[in-house]
Structure formats: C-alpha cells, structure tokens
C-alpha cells in the first residue's frame, strides 16, 4: 500500500527560472521514487534532478520540460508500484529574433513607391505585443503611410519613399518579459538628390605625434556638400582651422589628415554630407590616443616538480588592447610544448627543477611596451645535513637538538615534543637553521622530540630521545627561617633529588650533635618536645657519589605562639560618643597589635584626631559617626605567627525620650555610655 502525501501539481513556470515538482510518499517498507516525462524515465542532470523524492529544475527549459511529468514510487520487494497524478508546466517565455524583409522577396526589388513589409521574428508564450522603431524612434499605428499588424507582427509601408529609409527594429513584451530584435533591418530607398554614404570614417587609434587619416565620401545628384566638425562643433576647412587643429588638412575626396597628433586632438570628428534634398547625413568617428599603463607586480611563485602550474599575466590597461607574450632567458615561449604560452597564461607542464628561473611577461601596443618578471622556484624535498641525536642534557642548563636540512626554497622546520607542536616561548627557541634550544632544561623535558622539515615539495622528519641529567637539588629548598612552638612537637622536613638518590642528614651549624630528644629520620628533623635550647642554626646536607653534596641552612626560632588575653566585643555606640574596642595579646616574641577597620589597615601614624591605638592594643574612636560602623579586626603578630579576631561596631542615633518613658529607661540594646 503505497500512499502519496503530496502529488505534483501543474503550474506556471518561467523559462530559465527555478521550479519544483513535489512528491512525498509513505509505504510499509522501503520504496524508491523516480520520475517519468511523457512515460519515459527522467535522468538527473545539473539542470533537472531529483531532490529527495521531488523533482527540482534549476532552469526550466520550454523544449526539454514540455510534456507530462509523473512521480512513480516502487517497492522493489513486492514489486508494487504507484503513480502520482500527471503534472505539467505552462512555460512562459520570450525569444528574440531578427527583423526580416517579407515583401518584396529581396532588397534589390525595393523601389520608390513600392509596398514594403517587414516582419518581427520575436516569439513567445503568451503571445507578446509588438512595437516598431525607425532609427530608435517608436512608430505608432496609423501614422503616415504605414500600418502595423500586431497579429502578423508585420510593419507595412505603402508606398515606400526615401523618407522611410532608416534602421528598423522591433521590441515585444509579454507577461514573461521583454525582448528586442537581435538583428535590425536597414531600409534604403534611393532619392538621387539625397546624400548617400559611399565611405564612412572609422575610429582611429594613433600614437602621440603620429598622423591620423579619416576617410569620408557621399554621393548624390547634384553632388552633395561635405563638412568636417570637431567636438565643439568647430568646422575644419583648409582656410579656417581651429587653433588646436593647425595641422589638419581636408582633401578634395573628403578625407581628413591630422599630423603630429597630440592629446588635445583626441575626440569625436563628424563628417556631414548634405544633398540638394533630404536630411543631412552625420557620420562620426573617434580619434583615440594610444596609451599603455604599467603592469602589476608578480608575487614570486614556488612550484613542485612533476606538477602542472599556470601563471596568468594580466595585460595592462591600454588602447589599443595590448598584445601579450611570455619570454624566458630572452626567448619567446612557443604556443605548445611542455613550457608554453596559452592566451595570457604561462603554462608549465610536468615541471622539472631546470624550469626554475625568471620568466617575463611582455605587453605592447602603439603606445609602447611594458614588462614584468616573475621568479619561479621549483621546490625540492628537504635532505638531511644533520639529524637530531638522542641526547643527555643537564638540568638547569641550555640544551640543543640539531635539525639541519637543505632544500629549495629554504625549508621550514617545526618541532614536536610528545607529538605536541612546540610553540616558541621563553623556554623554547628554534634557530633559523632548525636547531632547537631549550633555554633551561627541566626534569620533565626528558621525552621524545621530533623535527619536521618541509617545503611545498614534501617533508622529512626524524626523532630523538632526550635524557635529562638531573642536578643535585633540594626539593623544595627548606625555608631559611622557621618557627617552632615551645613545649610542642615539631618537624622540619628536608628532601632532595639527584641523578642518584641522595642521602640526607641534619647537623647543628656549630657542629655539635643533636640532643637525644631530636631525631633525624630520612631527612625530617623531629623534635619530640621543643625546648628553648633547640633554637639555633641547623644545616641539611644532601649528598650522592657522582654529584657530591649540597647544604641548606635553617635558623630555627622557638616561640610561644600568640593567644588573645582580651578580645574586642560586639559594640553599639550612640552617634557622637566614644567607642572603645579592647584587644590584648601575649606570646614570645612579644606580639605587635594592628587594627583593620572596614577592610583597610589603620596606620597609627595617619589616624587623625578621632582615633587612637593604646600601648596595650586597645582602639578608641571619639565622636563616632554612622560611617564608622562596620567590622573591626585586631591583628596580633610576631616573627613566628599571626592571629586575628574581629567584632562589629554599630553607631546609632540617640533616641528622643518619649514622655511615657521615665528617665531611667534602659536603651533597647547593650551600649557603651560615656
């Protein structure tokens, strides 16, 4: 059971425009959809192709797309087939054609006073309407002695006279659009007294200071007059020449000669012939000065051997159009072969290394010659001068890995570390010759390195393993000043690494031995219970066979860690009163007190008249204001440790006593009353 959800529908279409015949199918199993045109399968082309199950037209063609389309769905398993309704296009089109002589049979038979019929061969669907023109001017039906038959597309002149002479064209328009005649008809009905063209002047291009000749001849009975004009309607005769045409000569046969042409002579020259009767005939020709501009520069090109490449030479702007040719080593390239010129292109087929060099594009016209060189390099695959070697690099020192290659053009070298591209930074530097420098070798630099050298022709690569020779060092170096809390357990760690695992031991700086309650366990100095005598200078010594020993000096201080004797309390003060925040700390060395208010340290030297910090550490704020509200932190510190405690200060308005309240009514919160 094949079901069509959408069937194609007949529709209007425009010649050359897009269209779509829709088809949508459902079925119990896989189906394939194809299209028929007048019963024959439709083959996909770029113009007309299946799009899903619909049929898409990139450009409707009135000849190839006329007929009946049908969408067919077929189940290849069951053989069931369903066909959609028929659909067709109503294609609208218009096509230009020439104006032709319908009557008489040939131009030779056209005589004055005979009937002349012209036909406009523009066709279309729907049928277009026609408009005729003589010398570009529209002719309307019923004008003097001519009739237009739109149905027949004919223009009839009866009788035809010299006044009907001219260039006849037609245009037609329909719902689809408009078209004008592709070829027009020149009707020439002789009147002996009318001037007729025998020789018309042609446009001329000349080089500066060369000469230019315009020919012009008319015939009539009696003979016609002939006059030359330049641009601004200035007449040119042998007796009166305009100042800028001093070197102009008009010959008896009507030709005009200009010698030593300059830029100001360029322009339109008009030759006017006037018979005894009839309109004047005006013929125009333009004198152009030859010119040639400079050529754009070529970028150097790099090609690979064996490939085919093209270099296009854009000719410079010029008049007349410059001719272009390619040369190599002073020899003009042929138009066929392996290295040859095709149009403006230089073609190199199956490129060889010997093709490298300078090729020159030449362009020339009457105004001169221009040339531009292009440097062509034929790339080669890099070859090794020195591959990277497996290396042992010392930690902390610069390390180098070579990658020396040669090729044309100069190869680019990139380095990879563990398959990751190395980007140059403060630690890695790639020299112009490809060598990699590791500025200060770290332990984790011990890994695989790979360098790749490339040109457009190809690349080569090699890898090397780096082993880092670790230096003997403390990891981490012990802090030079450390504090231990009196009467408590304490440990001072010391660890080190090197090429061989070092042994670590502690000793007092004065060389005396460690007391029995102090143990040295694999580099960790352990004090079971710190006494005042444990203070002093100690040395951690790390040593191994190949690298000797290193020492770290540590000064140990024994301290009583800080505790607060008095801590500030949450305090509420009336505005304008004095606030007291108490703080007292003890410890050894004796701690110093600092205060922090509203996230900034209160510098005792810059407190101003309202604030004061007492010797015992308490903070007084006189004449408190609302902006003094906030958290205040008492910080106690000595050379061994630091502790802090904080309390909020609230500044409130003093309540106005109500009559109902007695004088002894307490405030609604804990206050400092001063």
């Amino acid at each position: 059971a094949i079901v069509f959800i959408k069937q194609p529908s007949s529709q209007d279409a425009l010649q050359g425009r897009r269209a779509l015949l829709r088809c949508e199918v459902e079925a119990p199993g896989p189906v394939h959809v194809y299209w028929l045109l007048d019963g024959a399968p439709v083959q996909d082309t770029e113009r007309r192709f299946a799009q899903g199950s619909s049929l898409s037209f990139a450009a409707v063609d009135r000849l190839q797309d006329s007929g009946t389309f049908q969408c067919v769905a077929r189940d290849d398993v069951t053989g069931e087939e369903a066909r959609s309704a028929n659909a067709s296009f109503n294609i609208k089109w218009i096509e230009a054609g020439p104006v032709v002589l319908k009557h008489p049979a040939s131009e030779a038979e056209i005589q004055p006073q005979t009937q002349v019929t012209l036909r406009c061969h523009i066709d279309g669907h729907p049928r277009p309407t026609y408009q005729w023109f003589r010398d570009g001017t529209p002719l309307s039906d019923g004008q003097s002695n001519h009739t237009v038959s739109s149905k027949e597309r004919n223009l009839t002149l009866r009788p035809a006279g010299p006044e009907h002479s001219g260039l006849y064209s037609c245009c037609a328009h329909s719902a689809f659009g408009q078209a004008c005649s592709s070829q027009n008809f020149t009707l020439s009905i002789a009147d002996e007294s009318f001037a007729r063209v025998v020789l018309a002047p042609q446009d001329v291009v000349v080089a500066r200071y060369e000469e230019a000749m315009f020919h012009c001849q008319f015939s009539a009975q009696p003979p016609p007059s002939l006059q030359w004009l330049f641009e601004d309607e200035t007449p040119i005769t042998n007796r009166s020449r305009p100042p800028h045409l001093r070197r102009a000569t008009v010959f008896a046969n009507g030709s005009l000669l200009l010698t030593q042409v300059r830029p100001r002579n360029a322009g339109i020259y008009r030759c006017i012939g006037q018979g005894q009767r009839g309109p004047p005939i005006i013929l125009e020709a333009t004198l152009h000065l030859a010119e040639i501009e400079d050529m754009p520069l070529f970028e150097p090109r790099v090609f690979t051997a064996g490939s085919e490449e093209r270099v296009t030479c854009l000719p410079p702007k010029g008049l007349p159009e410059p001719s272009v040719w390619w040369e190599h080593a002073g020899v003009r390239l042929p138009t066929h072969g392996r290295v040859y010129q095709k149009g403006h292109e230089l073609v190199l087929a199956n490129i060889a290394e010997s093709d490298a060099g300078v090729y020159t594009c030449h362009a020339a016209n009457l105004a001169g010659q221009r040339r531009q060189d292009v440097n062509i390099t034929v790339a080669t695959v890099p070859s090794w001068l020195k591959k990277p070697q497996d290396s042992q690099l010392e930690e902390g020192k610069p390390g180098y890995l070579d990658c020396l290659t040669q090729a044309t053009p100069k190869p680019t070298v990139v380095w990879y570390r563990n398959q990751m591209l190395i980007s140059e930074d403060s630690r890695f530097e790639v020299f112009k010759n490809g060598t990699l420098r590791i500025n200060s070798v770290e332990v984790y630099d011990g890994t695989w390195y790979r360098c790749m050298s490339s040109t457009p022709a190809g690349s080569i690569e090699a890898q090397a393993r780096v082993q880092v020779l670790e230096k003997l060092k403390f990891t981490p170096p012990p802090q030079p000043q450390q504090c231990m809390e009196f009467d408590k357990e304490a440990t001072v760690p010391c660890s080190a690494t090197g090429r061989e695992k070092p042994t670590i031991k502690w000793e007092r700086a004065d060389g005396s031995s460690l007391p029995e309650w102090v143990t040295d366990n694999a580099g960790t100095l352990h004090f079971a219970r710190v006494t005042r005598d444990d203070a002093g200078n100690y040395t951690c010594i790390a040593s191994n066979g190949p690298q000797g020993q290193i020492r770290a000096h540590v000064q140990l201080t024994v301290a009583v860690f800080i505790t607060f004797k008095v801590e500030p309390e949450r305090t509420t003060v009336y505005q304008g009163h004095t606030a007291l925040l108490q703080c007292e700390a003890q410890g050894d060395p004796k701690p110093l007190i600092q205060w922090k208010g509203k996230d900034r340290i209160l510098d005792p030297t810059k407190l101003g008249p309202r604030m004061h910090i007492f010797q015992n550490g308490s903070l007084v704020i006189h004449d408190v204001a609302p902006e003094d509200s906030g958290r205040y932190t008492c910080i106690a510190g000595n050379s061994c440790n630091i502790k802090h405690t904080e309390a909020p200060l609230y500044v409130v308005d003093k309540p106005v006593p109500e009559e109902s309240e007695g004088p002894g009514s307490p405030p609604p919160y804990k206050m400092i009353q001063t």
Partner: antibody, heavy 122, light 107 residues
Framework: EVQLVESGGGLVQPGGSLKLSCAAS????????MHWVRQASGKGLEWVGR??????????TYAASVKGRFTISRDDSKNTAYLQMNSLKTEDTAVYYC?????????????WGQGTLVSVSS | DIQMTQSPSSLSASVGDRVTITCRAS??????LNWYQQKPGKAPKLLIY???NLDKGVPSGFSGSGSGTDFTFTISSLQPEHIATYYC?????????FGQGTRLEIK
Amino acid sequence: EVQLVESGGGLVQPGGSLKLSCAASGFTFSGCAMHWVRQASGKGLEWVGRIRSKANNYATTYAASVKGRFTISRDDSKNTAYLQMNSLKTEDTAVYYCTSRGYSGFDWFDYWGQGTLVSVSS
Amino acid sequence: DIQMTQSPSSLSASVGDRVTITCRASQDISNYLNWYQQKPGKAPKLLIYDASNLDKGVPSGFSGSGSGTDFTFTISSLQPEHIATYYCQQYDNLPITFGQGTRLEIK
C-alpha cells in the same frame, strides 16, 4: 470500514505523564504517516506532530510547543500509534485526535479519530 | 512556520446566500491546502483537498480555488446543516498549520 480510536486520556497533574494510543483498522496502517492534532476547548486546531512510515525510517517531527516533552511512536504489528506526553502543562489541556491522510491510487483519504480528552490540572 | 490567516473569523448569512471564506498563507504553498468543517463535539471533516478538489461524498455546493498564497472557499447556497466552524490547513511544509477558523451562523 476505516476506524481510528484514541484512548488513554484523563486527568493528570502538571509535571505528570500520560500515554495516548490510537488503534487503526480498515486501511493499510503500516503504509501511512500518522499525525496527532489537538484542540483546546473553544479554540482552533493545533498540529502536534507526525511519525512517518517504515519507507521513511519512522521519522518524527514535532510542533515547537511540545518538542522535547512529547514522543510519537508506532507499532505496525499492532496497527497502533502512540503519543507519550511528559512534563505536562496546564496549556496541554485539549482533545487529542490522531489522523492519517494521503492519496491511495488517485483518491485522497483523510481519516480522524473521535478524540480523547486530556486534562492537566492541580 | 507558515502562518495561515483566515477571514472573516465569524460570519452570519441567510439561508440560500452565497458564502465565501478566504485564507492567506504567509508564503507560497502551491496548492497544498485543505478545507475542513467541524461541528461541535465532532472531529473535523475534510471537504476540499489540494485547494480545489471535492472530497468523496461532499455535496457539490462546496468549492475551493486558489494557488500560491491566496485561497477561497465557497458555499454556493447556505443551508441550515452548514452551521459549523470551517478551517483551512496548509501541508506544504512542516509544521502543518491551520487557519484560526471561521464560525458560520444563520441569520
């Protein structure tokens, strides 16, 4: 005689789930696309979604208002289409119809069920 | 999404009158348009498919025309049994969309 019978409607709380069924008979169900359409009381018709036939790999398409919450499926062996509704909202309250349409030969068919009411309310 | 604008939204006419409903699509939908009749408490019933084709069993007093974006539905002579809501529906593109409906009453 062609019949489409919806079932599974009822009252459910916002955020709850419900599964509607549409049992088909009297035509080749497996060769048709099945659509669900709903209609809130006193309002117009709103298309909910569609499942295509095997020929089109059972492709589904949904209205933006239900996408990600509703799922349409079918069982050709049972001639039944389903509408699984999750994360229900009060605005999903409506009569839900299942429907199928297309050309069989050159005749257009358009089948609708009688509808089933879904009420989403707390 | 393609918007379907149906007008008028309600219509009152006398028995025997010629009644016309229009439907405009926000983009070209070719002839992929259906017209439905729905009576209270019932499922919609197809009257016209593909813009102008009368469904089987539908009286010839109903007709449809149009293509592209503008469509018309006509009842040549209004009868009491024609009281219902009428909907246009496009199926050129998913999501399928309906007009907002035209409620038809008898004066």
